[in-house]
């Protein structure tokens, strides 16, 4: 058993049929010595008396808010949560496996630049009685500071018969140099509590590997005389690291109709303009990627051909 | 300890081309190592990230773009002194800082070159003959060093009398390639910045 936060404790249980469970001793936070009784949750049934209460925790029915009283007055609470271990593996029931970039990916993180700021998000089908707490650091043995905000519900989607909820959190490395060469990864730890179930999820990454620039901005078209060719120009996104001659981007320019199966014109360039063939009912799209370290491409920025 | 804005004429910076070739060559070699050594811990997640130049050179700090010198997190650098007569310095007005930067890059390349050559000698003794260093990568390191054209003491190639542990050598190769790729990215950024300045 360990303390998650004040008056909240996590009991780690091997979860299999007829498992013996864990013996837990609760101590009432009071100078009083006698006349103390214990109850669980809203029940008035007295579970025991005395300053300490010994319980055998085997299942969710044994978890919950234990309260010690004296003469009708509440002295203190202890909330017990369960963390299940099945076949040596901690349960991952609360969050959905996003399967990208690989199986067992519960947390996904992205950074728009090298400033040390990043966003992580996760998915769940649970809508109520759910809380998250996020911690982060650079490295684990001698951790350096990363400050994370509160996790918030950022999107709701309907997937078939199920509703899916996306939560996200923003973090900022306390002293980040955009030009630095990372040798220790960022560690992100998410504590998830659903009712009386506790789970924790972790992700480890280098900022350089989670870079995804914003789309290029200010796309403009200039038709070329006596030609079907069009000059398309754009600018670096505002959120990208500066100077741009040091943090350079490369671009992919594509002309395509509404369907992905349609024919297309595609060209890659390091410049902020390109010449392509425009077709009726097609769009010109441009996306960006770090020129020197191939992490993710940005989303497309698009303008219609006509 | 930063790069000045007024440096060589645009397009005249001879090291840019070599640095692009360097990044390409090390990236290809790393990809080849990951594929060939698929049953070894050779991915970014599996290896320890070591920097053989740590406390010996200070390329990131010495080559910091002027715009980042206002960022205090970028300025916790160690003082290092270097020789200052490189041929990539295409202008007489080139500052001392830029010479420090390019000479730091030269020292990095020299250190990695020695490590890679030593390692290749060991890998050539491996009866499995599983992986060798790409000669193209070694040639590209050499080309960039020649373009930088700094005079410095030759680092003797490490020779070892004991029987090499090929498993450890291959893991060391992965560690070295990952670190060198990261440094090659920095070098490429620096050359691009200087070329644009």
């Amino acid at each position: 058993i360990w303390e998650l936060k004040k008056d909240v404790y996590v009991v780690e249980l091997d979860w299999y049929p007829d498992a013996p469970g864990e013996m837990v001793v609760l101590t009432c936070d009071t100078p009083e010595e006698d006349g103390i009784t214990w109850t669980l949750d809203q029940s008035s049934e007295v579970l025991g008396s005395g300053k300490t209460l010994t319980i055998q925790v085997k299942e969710f029915g044994d978890a919950g808010q234990y309260t010690c009283h004296k003469g009708g007055e509440v002295l203190s609470h202890s909330l017990l949560l369960l963390h299940k271990k099945e076949d040596g593996i901690w349960s991952t029931d609360i969050l959905k496996d996003q399967k990208e970039p690989k199986n067992k990916t519960f947390l996904r993180c992205e950074a728009k630049n090298y400033s040390g700021r990043f966003t992580c998000w996760w998915l769940t089908t649970i809508s109520t009685d759910l809380t998250f707490s996020v911690k982060s650091s650079r490295g684990s043995s001698d951790p350096q500071g990363v400050t994370c905000g509160a996790a918030t519900l950022s999107a709701e989607r309907v997937r078939g018969d199920n509703k899916e909820y996306e939560y996200s959190v923003e973090c900022q490395e306390d002293s980040a140099c955009p030009a630095a060469e990372e040798s220790l990864p960022i560690e992100v730890m998410v504590d998830a509590v659903h009712k009386l179930k506790y789970e924790n999820y972790t992700s480890s990454f280098f900022i350089r590997d989670i870079i995804k620039p914003d789309p290029p901005k200010n796309l403009q078209l200039k038709p070329l005389k006596n030609s079907r060719q069009v000059e398309v120009s754009w600018e670096y996104p505002d959120t990208w690291s500066t100077p741009h001659s040091y943090f350079s981007l490369t671009f992919c320019v594509q002309v395509q109709g509404k369907s992905k199966r349609e024919k297309k014109d595609r060209v890659f360039t390091d410049k902020t303009s390109a010449t392509v063939i425009c077709r009726k009912n097609a769009s010109i799209s441009v996306r960006a990627q770090d020129r020197y370290y191939s992490s993710s491409w940005s989303e497309w920025a698009s303008v219609p051909c006509s | 300890r930063n790069l000045p804005v007024a440096t060589p004429d645009p397009g005249m910076f001879p090291c840019l081309h070599h640095s692009q070739n360097l990044l390409r060559a090390v990236s290809n070699m790393l990809q080849k190592a990951r594929q060939t050594l698929e049953f070894y811990p050779c991915t970014s997640e599996e290896i320890d990230h070591e920097d053989i130049t740590k406390d010996k050179t200070s390329t990131v700090e010495a080559c910091l773009p002027l715009e980042l010198t206002k960022n205090e997190s970028c300025l916790n650098s160690r003082e290092t002194s270097f020789i200052t007569n490189g041929s990539c310095l295409a202008s007489r007005k080139t500052s001392f800082m830029m010479a420090l930067c390019l000479s730091s890059i030269y020292e990095d390349l020299k250190m990695y070159q020695v490590e890679f050559k030593t390692m290749n000698a060991k890998l050539l003794m491996d009866p499995k003959r599983q992986i060798f260093l790409d000669q193209n990568m070694l040639a590209v390191i050499d080309e960039l060093m020649q373009a930088l054209n700094f005079n410095s003491e030759t680092v003797p190639q490490k020779s070892s009398l004991e029987e090499p542990d090929f498993y450890k050598t291959k893991i060391k190769l992965c560690i070295l390639l990952h670190a060198f790729r990261i440094r090659a990215v920095t070098i490429d950024r620096v050359m691009s910045y200087l070329n644009a300045s």
């Epitope: 079907r228 199966r261 024919k263 297309k264 014109d265 060209v267 890659f268 063939i277 077709r279 009726k280 | -």
Partner: antibody, heavy 118, light 107 residues
Amino acid sequence: QVQLVQSGAEVKKPGSSVKVSCKASGGTFSDYYLHWVRQAPGQGLEWMGWIDPENGDTEYAPKFQGRVTITADESTSTAYMELSSLRSEDTAVYYCARNKELRYFDVIGQGTLVTVSS
Amino acid sequence: DIVMTQSPLSLPVTPGEPASISCRASQSISINLHWYQQKPGQQPRLLIAFASQSISGVPSRFSGSGSGTDFTLTISSLQPEDFATYYCQQSNSFPLTFGQGTKVEIK
């Protein structure tokens, strides 16, 4: 399976014209760009131009501008390349090629040898 | 027009050995570079698109690398059926242009 079948070999006199056909099968004809590329005996490849069969848009290499005409007939899934004012240096194998991507070729026809000789 | 220069023009290789062909562009073309193989009496066949993207059905021993002006086609271990002429093609701008070809011959 996508295939491009070209018309047979031709022998032409200098100053005349030649029209080579290329019939496509497999996939929708107008879903692809069609190009013509030629190769003189023992020489390399030379791009001549492309057509978008959907709208008839064409683009020609400056070298062949005014001398080459590329057309397409959607009803028969056939593209044509006509080269006029033939000279002996136009002796080559002419290939049609196609792709959903405009700028390179993933399927290439078997080629048509055009010999220009007096 | 962008001029593509291949080297060497002829490359004698022992079967089972690796081979590398170089292609250089007269100006930077990013990764807009494609490789084709042509056997005598046959049409060219696409091997690699956009400098390094493998093409379905092409053996994995063929790989491409490069960006900007310098590109390489590598055959990791030459098989008897790989002896042919190889062409690079730029798609950075029209007109599309090819290298003059590299003939890989049996040593």
